[in-house]
Each structure stands twice: as C-alpha cells, then as structure tokens.
Interface confidence: low
C-alpha cells in the first residue's frame, strides 16, 4: 500500500526556474464562448483546438468558429481558421478524428437554412491541409470510421437515410432508407435497425437488424421485432419484444449475427432497461433494471459465448435509461470494477470486484482517515468512491475516478469516508495497488491527471475563484509542490494531457476576463527537466499484484494466474518517457472452485464457494436454448470463469447434449432470417 | 434551498428610470447566468437579456437596447436590472431566472440547453402619470 | 430573430384526459428548447429542457418531444393542478425568445 504522510517529503530540485523555463502561455483571440480540443493521432504532438462563439455572451445571429493547431503539444497554437474557409464548425458534432495513426479529421459545417445538404472539411494530413466537400444530405450524426479502414465512413441523415463513404467522405452513397442506429462492426461490416411503418420511435420494438459486410451491396436481416442492438467484444446484442406481451429479453450472437442465442437473463418490461456495462472478448457485465422507477438493478456477468449469466452484484445503483451509473473500469490493474449500491436505507455506498465480478466487496477504509458523520461506528467504515452519479447530483466533485493501463495499480479518486457517499466536499484519495488500499492525496476537490505513466501526478484545486497555482507530485501523491504558473490567476476549465498518459506535457485551459470581455487562454508546462534523466534498472522494484497473503502459495492468484510487475521506485525521480511499455511476469495457477462461475440452474449461497442447484430447477431436465437449437446440459453446477488461465487442481464435469429439438422462444432463429441485394 | 427574491414594486412616471434589485441564495452565485424576463398584463414572456456573474458581461434583447442596463455585485450575490425612459408600456411583472445555459464552470464543451431553472417572484413596475 | 410559434392558443380538456401542444420553430433550434408552466399570479415553473428532458421534480405525466423546428408537450393524463398556460422557449441564438403560449382550461 501507499506508505502515509509522516515519511519524509524531498523536494525536487529547483523545480520552479525548471518549470518556468517550460511554461508556454498561448492567448486566444477569442471571446469566449466555448472551446473544444482533440488530439490527432498518437505522439504527433498535433493538437488541434476549435473555439466557437454565439450566445449568451453577445447577441448575434450567426456564431463564429476559429480553427487552431499545435505540433509541439500545446505549447504554440497557429490559427488556421482559413484553411477551413472561416466557415462557422457545428460544435454537437465535434472533431472526427481517425483511428490509430491515420492523421484524417472531418470537420462539420454550420449551413444556411434552405441548403441541400451538409458540408464538411477533411484532412488526411494531421490537419495541415483540408478539403470543403458538400455533402448529398445533412448529417444528424458524428461521420463515424470504420475501424478497419479509415477511408470507410458511415453518418445518419436528418432523413434517417443511411449513408456510406468509401474514399474519406469525398464521395457518398445512401446505402439504405428508414435507419435508426448504425454502428460498425468488425470487418468493415455495419450493422443498423429499420423502421417500416412511421419512425423509429413508433417502431421501437418493430425494428429490424440488417448487415451488410459489402459497404451496401447486398444486406441480410438478422432480427425482427427489435427494440435495439449493442456490441460489445465479439458479442452482439439485441433485446427482442415478445410475442405475447411488452417485455423484451437480450439475445446474443458471436456470429455477427448468423445464429443467435437467448440470454439466460431476466426479461424487462417498457419501463425498464439493459445496459452492457463492460465487455470484451471474453465476458460482458450486463445491467438489468429493476421493475417500477427504483434507479437500481442486478449486474450480471456472463459466460464465455454470453449466455449463461451468473448474478454479480444486487441493488446497483442505475437511474433510469441513459441516466447515471458509477461502474468503472479500473484500467491500472487487471480483473478490477467498482460501482455504486444503493442501500435498503436509500444511502449509496461503494463496491469493488478484484475478480471480475466474482466477489464484491466494501473498500478499506485509508489509514490515515477519520470516519464522517455518515458512520454509525467511528472506528469502522469504508471509503465511498464520487464517480458519474455524484456529478449528475452537482456534488462538489469536479472529476470521475482515474486510472491508466500503463501507470500499473494508481487509481486516484474523489471520496469520503464513513458508511456511505456524503454529500459534503469530499476529498482526493489514491490507491497504489489497484484499489485494495487508499491514502488520502489532497484535501477537497482537485482535478488531476497522470503523465508519464505514472512518474508524476498533476492536480489543480477546484475552485470557483480564479487560480494560477498548480500541484505536482513524483512519487505517487505522496509529496506535493506547488507551482505558480502565471501572476494572473485564470478562472479554470479543464486539465489537458495527451490520451494514454505517456506525455510529460499538461495543458491548463481557462479563461481571462475583463469588462464585457474574455479569452480563453492554455498554459502547457513540459515535466521533462523535473525527470531529468531517464529511469534505469535500479529504478524499479518487483510488485505482485493482487496479493494479499504473501504466506499462501496462491497469493495474487485471479482469473487463474499471479503477474509480477516492475514498478517504479516512489524515491526514483526519472523519466519513464514515452516508448515505456509495462513489464509484467504471469504465472499459471492451480485451479479451485473460484475460478468457475455456477453454471445455468445453479448459484452460489452468500459466503460459499460451492454452487447449489436452485430450487425452483431442482428435479427437472436442464435445457436452454443454443444457436436456435434445444439442448440439454449435464452439469455438476460449474463453468470455467471467462478469461481464466488455470490449469490442474479442481475439475468440474460438464457435458452439453444437442436435443434436435427447435427453440420455441427463440425470437432470431435462423429460418426468420432473409438476404437482399441491392 | 436555491432561491431568487426581488425587491418590491415600484410605481414611476413616464420618463423616468427603474432599479429592480435580484438576490441569490442557496448556490454558488458565479456558476449561473442571470436572464431578466417580463411579463406585461395578459401577455407572454418576453426576454430582456442575460448578465454572466463572472465579469459581469452582458448580452441584451435588441428591444431593449440602449435602455436596459444589467450589474451584478459577486459580495452580495445581487443582480441588478436598470430600465430607463420608461413609457406606459413598460408597466409589467420583471422576473429574473438563473440561467444555466453557460454555467461559467461547466468547462469548455458546449453542455446543450438546460432552461431558466429558478426564478424570483417577480417585481410589478407600473408606469403611470 | 427566431419566431416562436405556439397552438393551438387555448386548448379545453376535461380532466384524465390527454393534452398535446405544439410549438414551431422559425428556424432549427437543435435541442435547445424548453416548455414553462405558469399559473396566475405565479412565475414561470421549469418542466422541460433540452426538448425531452424533465425538470427535477416534475411529474412522469409531463414529456415533451422533437428537434430541430417541431416539438410537442404532453401531458399525458391532465390533473386539476395541469391547468396553466404553458409556454415554448428557444435557446439556440439570441435574443432568447418565447411563443405565444397555449392556455390549457377545463372542458
């Protein structure tokens, strides 16, 4: 864990002229309206920033936009507003910028009333050039890449018309009518719903699912009666209507949807929802609503083929369709998620999984903190995470949790510490190890953000005053040092660093404001002279992840295997630098019944690792439906956990009999199902 | 709780000016714009402008222009309304609404329309010789 | 400016039943649109903003729909506290401005 506050804090090394040297203030000539920024392309230090301006601030009738680009990551911007022909961009629409290192951006233009169609601005340069094209249609979505090809491009007319483009958006095509929700799949295949009566709020639950994997040659129907469709990993999903009644049951295909399967989940009514939470190649975390307006449901995790589901977590905290939910994925340490509960007492509290929903539990309360009001007993509770609800709630909580694949175990995180979430000002906690331990790291609301995969934390004081002062810490947050970065304080908006936090650059974005005036304004300060030299062998220690008995032979043991990392030295002052890649050892582990989940028909009692068959199968043949065929299970109540790597030790019996026999309540069988060409 | 009371009704002559005072309690007053809005006898809403707490910048409807004069005072939370040369057809309820629609730290991404959320009770100005 | 247009101007429905105002944008507003009940001798009360979404606290009786120039409020079965006049507002450019408003009275 994080060692505590009493440990000595060394100060780097005449920080403030490194810092000042490496300060790099760029005004805009902008009032202010608003301002958004992208990053194009990975370490090409391109940024390119769009500042739009209409009302409330001055009465217009047309906004303005302005264009601008850096190459040195913030630290000098070029107007390059002209490249787009002054054009006003819509700012709902954003910057499209292309997968991977493709360097294509599509801006999207505001026309006037009576045009035919949208226009568009396209680079495939990393924006040093663009291109005006009109467009066929007006757009009412994002240009959306295929993720194959960054030439492919599919958007959704206002006229709910289905349009693709295969050489970058020069060129565009409608390749069906009557679309509600297009989304690329794998293999430059699209997948969308149809509507055949009024429109796609009249038809929900009338829809149709086609693909085409030939760009709108030819299509296939792969669903009827569909409410909507998601991916997720290699799965899709469908929730499907009934036949007889308004509830609606998930359907999965692995196939891009050649056979489907029924999801052994609940069905849910018109007031209630699904939602795939988290997913990739091998499980997914689904939600399922609870009946009547209760802002909770039930998480389940599913199986490796996305049917058989195992209940994960009751009461999660979920406010209605679209609404908020605190689910997150720790990216900094394998197999880790924490979430919201609420509780019989309507009280929200923090719950963490370090086994991929396996097992939920509270966090540890950080050593060096007081329980607050919200705690029955002083001497017992547990830190409750601020993540997407408490935002939406207008708490004082200016950020959601943090953590970053390469910075291994940091997760930082606004919190309080008692028996459930207060809504009074929280304050900033960290952990080191992935979450099962946490320090306080600063007092009251920061926003912060991790460069260098970990080699420095950077935060900034959230305040309604303006600030000029930002904090920096190189071992993890447990020293800080303050740095004024400008004698003019700036009223704050929002910390940038390059996605991936292997920069050394932050951005600090805000605005100046003086009589009926206001700039916006970027300082971006480069933490290279502060990691002076570049982090050797000695550098770095052995870490075992997961571990929490270093006595037991299975220490660190999850989803069937232990990984060492090489982690660098809180004391190490150095510079990770950008090609840094994470250095980890896995080791296979001895199976036991908690690398199996309980398979159809059973579940596990609270506090048990065994799986029980549950009484209401108990005696009656196990079948469900598969690939639209029945078939019976043989099973002694087990299933290897998705992604589990264990070899040896306990070995469950299982055997799946096809029984010939055609699914009745499988709404996607493949007979259902037609081709067309175009 | 959130809340926006005015000052009490005012009675001018033709000609003359008034101040309507507006004061905000129960938030942090520099998070939300400020729109006045008015409403004569038997008629709709009609919008005069908006103030940002923040610097105080202004932005008024065209009618109004060069007659209307918004402040704003951050020690007290207090916005101002000055309507001057006023005519009998100015006789009307002024409410002000907080208005998120720039809520000055919400960030630089445009966050789409969220309404006049709260508003005063409203201050009846009649203007009679 | 844009011009807010509201109808029908007065609509009589008896209570339980349901209620549909429509509101017409001179030119596209996107989203940036809400719906305000006021009773007599009352300020305005927030309902609906971003077109679809329900002020806090506002009944589930309330929704309102439509983009760009056509949005529609629904009351979907009228109680005797419904009874208000109701009015439209765009926020897209300045000046903000208002519709007529449509009276809602018992039948």
């Known amino acids: 864990s994080a060692p505590g506050e009493d440990e000595e804090c060394g100060r780097v090394r005449d920080f403030v002229a490194k810092l000042a040297n490496n300060t790099h203030q760029h005004v805009f000539d902008d009032l202010r309206g608003s301002v958004s920024l992208s990053w194009v392309g990975d370490s090409t230090g391109v940024i390119l920033v769009l500042t739009t301006f209409h009302v409330p601030l001055v009465i217009m009738t047309f906004g303005q936009s302005k264009l601008y680009r850096s190459e040195d990551y913030g630290k000098n911007f070029k107007d390059i507003t002209d490249l787009i022909n002054n054009t006003f961009i819509r700012t709902e629409f954003g910057m499209a910028i292309g997968p991977e290192n493709s360097g294509k951006v599509v801006l999207t233009a505001e026309v006037s009333g009576g045009s035919r169609g949208g226009r568009i601005f396209r680079s495939s340069d990393f924006a040093k050039n663009f291109v005006q094209t009109d467009l066929p249609f007006h757009p009412l979505t994002q240009m959306m890449y295929s993720p194959q090809n960054s030439d492919y491009l599919l958007a959704l007319s206002t006229e709910n018309g289905l349009w693709v483009s295969k050489n970058f958006g020069g060129k565009w095509e409608e390749i069906h009518k009557a679309v509600c929700l297009a989304k690329w799949g794998s293999d430059n295949t699209i997948f969308f719903t149809t509507y055949a009566n009024g429109s796609c709020k009249a038809d929900l639950g009338a829809l149709e699912l086609w693909r085409t994997s030939d760009l709108g040659k030819s299509f296939k129907t792969i669903g009827v009666k569909i409410y909507s469709f998601g991916l997720g990993g290699r799965f899709l999903f469908a929730s499907v209507m009934a036949d007889k009644d308004t509830t609606r049951r998930i359907h999965v295909s692995t196939d891009q949807g050649d056979t489907w399967s029924m999801a052994q989940l609940p069905s849910v009514g018109q007031e209630q929802f699904y939602s795939i939470l988290a997913a990739n190649d091998d499980m997914v975390f689904m939600h399922v609503d609870e009946p009547g307006d209760t802002g909770f449901g039930t998480i389940f995790t599913s199986d490796d083929r996305g049917i058989v589901y195992s209940k994960s977590l009751d009461r999660h905290l979920y406010t209605t369709t679209g609404g908020e939910t605190d689910f997150t994925n720790v990216t900094s340490l394998r197999g880790v998620y924490i979430t919201s509960v609420l509780s019989e007492d309507n009280s929200i509290q923090t719950m963490i999984t370090f086994d991929q929903g396996g097992r939920w539990t509270h966090l540890r309360k950080p050593e060096n903190s007081e329980c607050d009001a919200t705690a029955k007993n002083k001497n017992e509770c547990s830190l409750h995470i601020h993540a997407s609800y408490s935002i939406s709630q207008k708490l004082n909580v200016p950020m959601a949790p943090l953590s970053e694949p390469n910075a291994v175990g940091i997760v930082i995180a606004h919190g309080s510490v008692g028996d459930a979430i207060s809504v009074m000002v929280p304050d900033v906690y960290i952990s080191d190890d992935g979450g099962y331990s946490w320090t306080k790291m600063l007092e009251g609301p920061h926003y912060y953000t991790i460069l260098d995969s970990g080699g420095i934390i950077v935060a900034i004081e959230h305040s309604s005053r303006p600030i000029n002062v930002i904090k920096f810490s190189t071992d993890e947050g447990q020293c800080w040092q303050t740095y004024t970065f400008t004698r003019d304080p700036i009223y704050f908006t929002g910390l940038a660093s390059e996605p991936g936090a292997r920069s050394m650059n932050i951005s600090i974005w805000g605005f100046t404001e003086s009589f009926l005036t206001s700039q916006w304004v970027s300082y971006t300060i480069d933490f290279k002279d502060i990691l002076e030299r570049n982090c050797e062998e000695k550098d770095y220690t052995i870490w075992l992840a997961h571990s929490t008995d270093p006595e037991d032979y299975e220490d660190g043991c999850i989803l069937g295997y232990k990984e060492q990392f090489l982690r660098l030295r809180k004391s190490s002052v150095c510079q990770n630098g950008r090609d840094y890649v994470v250095t980890k050892q896995p080791s296979i582990c001895l199976c036991s019944l908690e690398d199996f989940l309980c398979d159809f028909g059973y579940y596990r009692p609270e506090n048990d690792s065994k799986c029980v068959e549950q009484p209401e199968l108990k005696g009656h043949d196990l079948e469900f439906c598969l690939y639209g065929r029945e078939e019976h299970l043989t099973t002694n109540g087990y299933r290897k956990i998705p992604g589990d790597k264990c070899q040896g030790g306990v070995n469950p019996v299982r055997e799946v009999k096809d029984l010939k026999k055609k699914c009745t309540s499988n709404f996607l069988s493949p007979e259902k199902q037609n081709s067309k060409s175009n | 709780q959130v809340q926006l009371v005015q000052s009490g009704a005012e009675v001018k002559k033709p000609g003359a000016s008034v101040k309507v005072s507006c004061k905000a309690s129960?938030?942090?007053?520099?998070?939300?714009?400020m729109s006045w809005v008015r409403q004569a006898p038997g008629q709709g809403l009609e919008w005069m402008g908006i103030?940002?707490?923040?610097?105080?910048?202004?932005s008024y409807a065209q009618k109004f222009q060069g007659r209307v004069t918004m402040t704003r005072d951050t020690s007290t939370s207090t916005v101002y309304m000055e309507l001057s040369s006023l005519r009998s057809e100015d006789t009307a309820v002024y409410y002000c609404?907080?208005?998120?629609?720039?809520?000055?730290?919400?960030?630089?991404?445009?966050?789409?329309?969220?309404?006049?959320?709260?508003w005063g009770q409203g201050t009846t100005v009649t203007v009679s010789s | 400016e844009i011009v807010m247009t509201q109808s029908p101007a007065t609509l009589s429905v008896s209570p339980g039943e349901r209620a549909t105002l429509s509101c017409r944008a001179s030119?596209?507003?996107?989203?940036?649109l809400a719906w305000y009940q006021q009773k007599p001798g009352q300020a305005p009360r927030l309902l609906i903003y971003?077109?679809?979404t329900r002020a806090t606290g506002i009944p589930a009786r309330f929704s309102g729909s439509g983009s760009g120039t056509e949005f529609t409020l629904t009351i979907s079965s009228l109680q005797s506290e419904d009874f208000a006049v109701y009015y439209c507002?765009?926020?897209?450019?300045?000046?903000?401005?208002f519709g007529g408003g449509t009276k809602v009275e018992i039948k």
């Open positions: 609404a907080r208005d998120p629609s720039g809520i000055a730290l919400a960030g630089p991404a445009s966050r789409g329309y969220y309404g006049m959320d709260v």
């Open positions: 129960g938030y942090t007053f520099t998070k939300y714009y």
């Open positions: 103030i940002n707490p923040i610097g105080g910048s202004t």
């Open positions: 030119q596209s507003v996107s989203s940036n």
């Open positions: 971003g077109a679809s």
């Open positions: 507002q765009q926020a897209r450019l300045g000046p903000w401005t």
